[in-house]
């Protein structure tokens, strides 16, 4: 009786595997001792003419590693649209604006990247801006998360190495589809599916946890998950189904916080792992995946239990010529408002990159046409003209883009929130009833925060985008909310107030604050007109006194 089975590529529609990794084709991490500014350099290599990238910067929360000032250099070989997120820190971006296009204007200082040809020249130039903290070269990334702040265990010099594991400093998700294989196990009755993930050893062997997220939408009650990795890998498993789990090392399961389960010895070959699945009565290996050393793996199986299907031989086709993408073109249209004027500036180079030919750009009132400058089409109007619709807090219009004859025009609704008509305030409370505001917080005591917007309005929705507590030069920057998610177990996003004001609570542990001090609580608010998805941001802050429990005056 055959133990193994012939693994075949799986039709990608049946499931997908995505992962994030810290391994880059070339890179290094260093600690920039006593540097006021840390410099990070990203070399991005894209295969296609136009790519999309999500780039997120995260501020470090480790003691003594407060992020002071950051200089980020982005070097791309091709055109790339960047969706950018960063905490409220002094940030400088250097990039070639003819290649790198940011969706929305990042709220940062921008430096033009000089025309340098070699990586060495770019690195020499970057070194004049501050101490280089990280360098990474990435092949076709889809998303990157860069952790700011110093790594005290890193060397003092950043010397790029091939196939470098960037550790906690950088995680990225490749765009390339991970090959998934599958096979039937002959001679096994019943229907039990096996999902096998094999992590290959990396260049650096240090203890690490791999998070495995698995989402199955099948109707079979029976499944097995087999995870094999190098001896230094333990696993954190987040799955929506109950199933048998077999792993090397040690694992814990999200639904049981704090659980630890000892793994077992597993064979180190694909066929050996398949044999283990057979021992557990699996009748089909629904997905077999081999990956480099990763941080997170997400496995989605959308049609498990259906007819077993492998991918047909690829058919060679000629890709269609790139044509103007309305979606990307629309994303370039971002209104800016202030002093009772709405302005839109469309970068002509970016329009060209998208291979779009525009013959006109107007507001709803077509007599209000864009002005053609050297490098931009600029459409501007006071709130009182060009068909602007003005309500208590929102100003709206419609932008019409015309193309050469034969193509219908594109229309996009644009809106601005009239910031001058709204006021925002942070309130700190010591009980979940949000009755009496305070400006003093005791270490170890739960604090409750509410963002109040006045006057009350249903026209604008407010969300907490990020919040942090700056404990001054002696202390750390404590990230409380990042990317609309509570950071750590001490922070909880609460239900909004009856009026819709965002609320959250946090617990300031004693070890987070070296000595009783004052701090600044800052929140970045994402404001959105209720009829549109485009957001604007507003930062609100308040000063806090932080006292030790014994100094609080409580008897």
């Amino acid at each position: 009786e055959r133990v193994g089975c012939d693994l075949q590529p799986v039709d990608p529609t049946r499931g997908e595997v995505t992962f994030t990794t810290s391994q880059v084709s070339e890179g290094c991490v260093a600690q920039a001792a006593n540097a006021v500014r840390e410099v990070h350099v990203l070399f991005l290599d894209f295969p296609g003419m136009l790519s999309h990238l999500e780039l997120t910067l995260q501020a470090s929360k480790q003691n003594g590693t407060e992020t002071q000032e950051v200089f980020l250099v982005l070097v791309s070989n091709k055109n790339v649209f960047v969706k950018f997120q960063a905490p409220e820190i002094p940030l400088h971006l250097a990039y070639d604006s003819s290649l790198v296009i940011f969706q929305g204007q990042p709220r940062v200082n921008i430096t033009v990247l000089p025309s340098l040809t070699s990586r060495k020249q770019i690195l020499d130039w970057a070194a004049t801006k501050g101490a280089i903290t990280s360098i990474a070269a990435l092949d076709d990334p889809q998303s990157i998360v860069l952790q700011l702040g110093q790594d005290p265990k890193a060397p003092f010099l950043c010397l790029p190495e091939a196939h470098k594991d960037m550790g906690a400093t950088l995680e990225w998700q490749p765009r390339a589809q991970t090959p998934v294989q599958s096979c039937r196990l002959e001679g096994v009755s019943g229907h039990k599916e096996a999902y096998i993930l094999r992590i290959l050893p990396g260049s650096e062997a240090g203890p690490r946890t791999v998070t495995v997220m698995m989402e199955l939408s099948c109707t079979s009650g029976d499944a097995i998950l087999i995870l094999h990795g190098p001896p230094y890998v333990s696993w954190f498993i987040d799955i929506n189904h109950s199933m048998q789990i077999l792993t090397t090392g040690e694992y814990s399961v999200k639904i049981f916080p704090g659980s630890k389960v000892k793994g077992v010895e597993l064979p180190d070959t694909p066929q050996g792992l398949i044999a283990e699945a057979r021992k557990l009565n699996a009748s089909i290996v629904t997905s077999f995946v081999e990956l480099p050393l990763v941080s997170n793996v997400s496995l989605r199986a959308s049609s498990c239990g259906g007819v077993f299907q492998t991918t047909p031989a690829p058919v060679v086709t000629t890709p269609p010529k790139d044509t103007c993408s309305p979606v990307l073109l629309m994303s370039l249209i971002q209104p800016k408002c202030g002093n009772q004027v709405m302005t839109l500036a469309l970068n002509k180079k970016h329009v060209q990159t998208l291979q779009c030919t525009i013959t006109g750009l107007t507001f709803w009132d077509s007599s209000c046409q864009a002005e053609d400058t050297d490098d931009h089409l600029v459409l501007s109007s006071a709130y009182s003209s060009c068909g602007m619709k003005v309500t208590a807090h929102v100003v709206s219009n419609e932008v019409i883009i015309s193309f050469p004859s034969g193509s219908p025009p594109l229309r996009k609704k644009v809106q601005c929130i009239d910031m001058d008509s709204l006021s925002f305030q942070l309130g700190l409370y010591l009980s979940p009833h949000f009755l009496q505001a305070s400006n003093t917080i005791e270490l170890g005591q739960q604090a409750f925060v509410q963002v109040s917007v006045s006057p009350l309005t249903s026209e604008v929705t407010v969300q907490l985008d990020s919040c942090h507590l700056d404990l001054g030069p002696e202390g750390d920057m404590v990230e409380l909310i990042q990317s609309r998610t509570a950071k750590g177990s001490c922070v909880t996003l609460l239900s909004p107030s009856p009026e819709g004001d965002p609320r959250f609570s946090f617990l300031l542990r004693v070890y987070m604050v070296p000595t009783p001090t004052a701090g600044t609580l800052s929140c970045n608010l994402a404001l959105r007109p209720s009829t549109l998805s485009q957001e604007v941001y507003k930062t609100v802050s308040m000063r806090l006194n932080i006292v030790s429990p014994d100094l609080s005056g409580k008897g």
Partner: antibody
Framework: QVQLQQSGAELVKPGSSVKISCKAS????????MHWIKQQPGNGLEWIGW????????KYNQKFNGKATLTADKSSSTAYMQLSSLTSEDSAVYFC????FGVGDYWGQGVMVTVSS | DTVLTQSPALAVSPGERVSISCRAS??????MHWYQQKPGQQPKLLIY???NLASGVPARFSGSGSGTDFTLTIDPVEADDTATYFC?????????FGAGTKLELK
């Protein structure tokens, strides 16, 4: 807090069917399995099966195939077990228990089913 | 089916340490769980996946073992621990319970 409230005791005739309910509160009903367990006096505990309300997946102890049918109503966060062709052997206390990976972390108070003519 | 064998009864004095064993007829990985049941009540989870203490359970209770031999330990035993203790495995189909160990206090 997590609570599983089971329906009241049942006195039923042999050959008939009974449907008992288990109303969940205090957690996301669709994120956990709901297990059903039988306990006869002096006979210990017997696992009947589980249902995953998230997508209706079920897994049965083969011994109860055809005897027990597990269903769940997401809108009311209620799990049901129907027992059919009842005999005196089915007289027992039936528990529902919230679970994952076969662990029953919260249990209902139990429903006494008595089959008697 | 996987048969779980428990000793039927134990009698100990308060303050002592007691170990209740559960042996499986075949390997169950680490998927052994322990429950406490008092007369007229539903079972209560004490230990899950061999050694993990369930929420709200005193640290006097601990679990150990893997493969086929598992132990529930109570140290020290208190008067309130008088109950029947069941082991349960959820690795092999169908899931099965032990017959229970009745713990009495002297």
């Amino acid at each position: 807090q997590v609570q599983l409230q089971q329906s009241g005791a049942e006195l039923v005739k042999p050959g008939s069917s009974v449907k008992i309910s288990c109303k969940a509160s205090g957690y996301t009903f669709t994120s956990y399995d709901m297990h059903w367990i039988k306990q006869q006096p002096g006979n210990g505990l017997e696992w009947i099966g589980w249902i995953y309300p998230g997508n209706g997946n079920t897994k049965y102890n083969q011994k109860f195939n055809g005897k027990a049918t597990l269903t769940a109503d997401k809108s009311s966060s209620t799990a049901y077990m129907q027992l059919s062709s009842l005999t005196s052997e089915d007289s027992a206390v039936y528990f529902c228990a919230r679970g994952k990976f076969g662990v029953g972390d919260y249990w209902g108070q139990g429903v006494m089913v008595t089959v008697s003519s | 089916d996987t048969v779980l064998t428990q000793s039927p009864a134990l009698a100990v004095s308060p303050g002592e340490r007691v170990s209740i064993s559960c042996r499986a007829s075949e390997g169950v990985n680490s998927y052994m769980h322990w429950y406490q049941q008092k007369p007229g009540q539903q079972p209560k989870l004490l230990i899950y996946i061999a050694s993990n203490l369930a929420s709200g359970v005193p640290a006097r209770f601990s679990g150990s073992g893997s493969g086929t031999d598992f132990t529930l330990t109570i140290d020290p035993v208190e008067a309130d621990d008088t109950a029947t203790y069941f082991c349960q495995q959820s690795w092999n189909d169908p899931y099965t319970f032990g017959a229970g160990t009745k713990l009495e206090l002297k």
